[in-house]
């Protein structure tokens, strides 16, 4: 426990935020499921928000959702429709810095 605390303290002194991998563009078919992955790491652990065409993503029960993952965040859209087309952007912040990545879903 003591060493864990020391490691945490060291990390807190050296805050960082990194986009580990740019988001990919995704082309898929109607009715299928698309997943967009926001791969970021940081200290403190970053807060991640999702945007579609510059607006906060509207979650829909059983169809469109996002969740935290080990590597950052994943946005999943089931039963895809043409209306889902657009620019999807994840924005991550650790309270000091901001990084973002954008992908196109078509």
């Amino acid at each position: 426990p003591t060493s864990s605390w020391n490691i945490s303290s060291e990390l807190n002194k050296d805050s960082y935020l990194t986009l580990d991998e740019p988001m990919n563009n995704i082309t898929t078919s109607l009715g299928q499921t698309a997943e967009l992955h926001c791969k970021v790491s940081g200290n403190p652990p970053p807060t991640i928000r999702w945007f579609k065409n510059d607006a906060p993503v509207v979650q829909e029960p059983r169809r469109l959702s996002f969740r935290s993952t080990i590597y950052g965040s994943r946005l999943r859209i089931r039963n895809l429709d043409t209306t889902d087309t657009g620019y999807f952007q994840c924005v991550a912040t650790n309270g000091k810095e901001v990084v973002s990545s954008t992908g196109v879903l078509f």
């Epitope: 563009n25 082309t27 945007f51 579609k52 065409n53 510059d54 607006a55 906060p56 993503v57 509207v58 043409t82 209306t83 889902d84 087309t85 657009g86 620019y87 952007q89 954008t102 196109v104 078509f106």
Partner: antibody, heavy 119, light 107 residues
């Protein structure tokens, strides 16, 4: 400076065809959605079609699906709207417009080109 | 398709007046609404994007706001060059449907 310039409009008979061009400059054409929007005389704006040139992905309004084809030539930085089986109700000023990345809003528009479908 | 119901269809106002135009979306479009100004014989011009963000070069008398699925364009003090037709557009879902337009005329 960003510019979009349409051409190709004119008078055509019902059932005829026309191809509109939208020449783009001043930005990386491949990475922006390019739209066609039309406006019938004295009426409001109607979205027609969109293309994402990097891959050629396309979508159409129901009113033109199967009759109009949107395409792009990234080597010429130009988008096209091929209009077949034209009807009187297709008479309008046709604008091409660029998306304000990554918003869905259209920030740059061409000057428009008039398409008149009449016998 | 999502419907954007814009009101009023026309209004008469004087220079210096405060003008408000509203659009209601038939379902959630988050904050993805744009407003355009169009003058006769000209292409539309972007004024507001993402419901409330002022586009570059647009005078600060123009502003946008959102309350749920209701969106408002406000011109705080109408100027002579503001007499035109205004359109809203939802930009969240395809197709990016437009409102019917509001013509702002001189009283």
């Amino acid at each position: 400076e960003v510019q979009l310039v349409e051409s190709g409009g004119g008078l055509v008979q019902p059932g005829g065809s026309l191809r509109l061009s939208c020449a783009a400059s001043g930005f990386t054409f491949s990475y922006y959605f390019i739209h066609w929007v039309r406006q019938a005389p004295g009426k409001g704006l109607e979205w027609v079609a969109v293309i994402y040139p990097d891959g050629g992905y396309t979508l159409y309004a129901d009113s033109v699906k199967g009759r109009f084809t949107i395409s792009a030539d990234t080597s010429k930085n130009t988008a096209y709207l091929q209009m077949n089986s034209l009807r009187a109700e297709d008479t309008a000023v046709y604008y091409c417009a660029r998306i304000y990345y990554p918003s869905g809003a259209m920030d740059y528009w061409g000057q428009g080109t008039l398409v008149t479908v009449s016998s | 398709d999502i419907q954007m119901t814009q009101s009023p269809s026309s209004l008469s106002a004087s220079v210096g007046d405060r003008v408000t135009i509203t659009c209601r979306a038939s379902q959630s479009v988050s904050s993805a609404v744009a407003w355009y100004q169009q003058k006769p014989g000209k292409a539309p011009k972007l004024l507001i994007y993402s419901a409330s963000s002022l586009y570059s070069g647009v005078p600060s008398r123009f502003s946008g706001s959102r309350s749920g699925t209701d969106f408002t364009l406000t011109i705080s003090s109408l100027q002579p060059e503001d007499f035109a037709t205004y359109y809203c557009q939802q930009t969240y879902w395809y197709p990016g449907t437009f409102g019917q337009g509001t013509k702002v005329e001189i009283k």
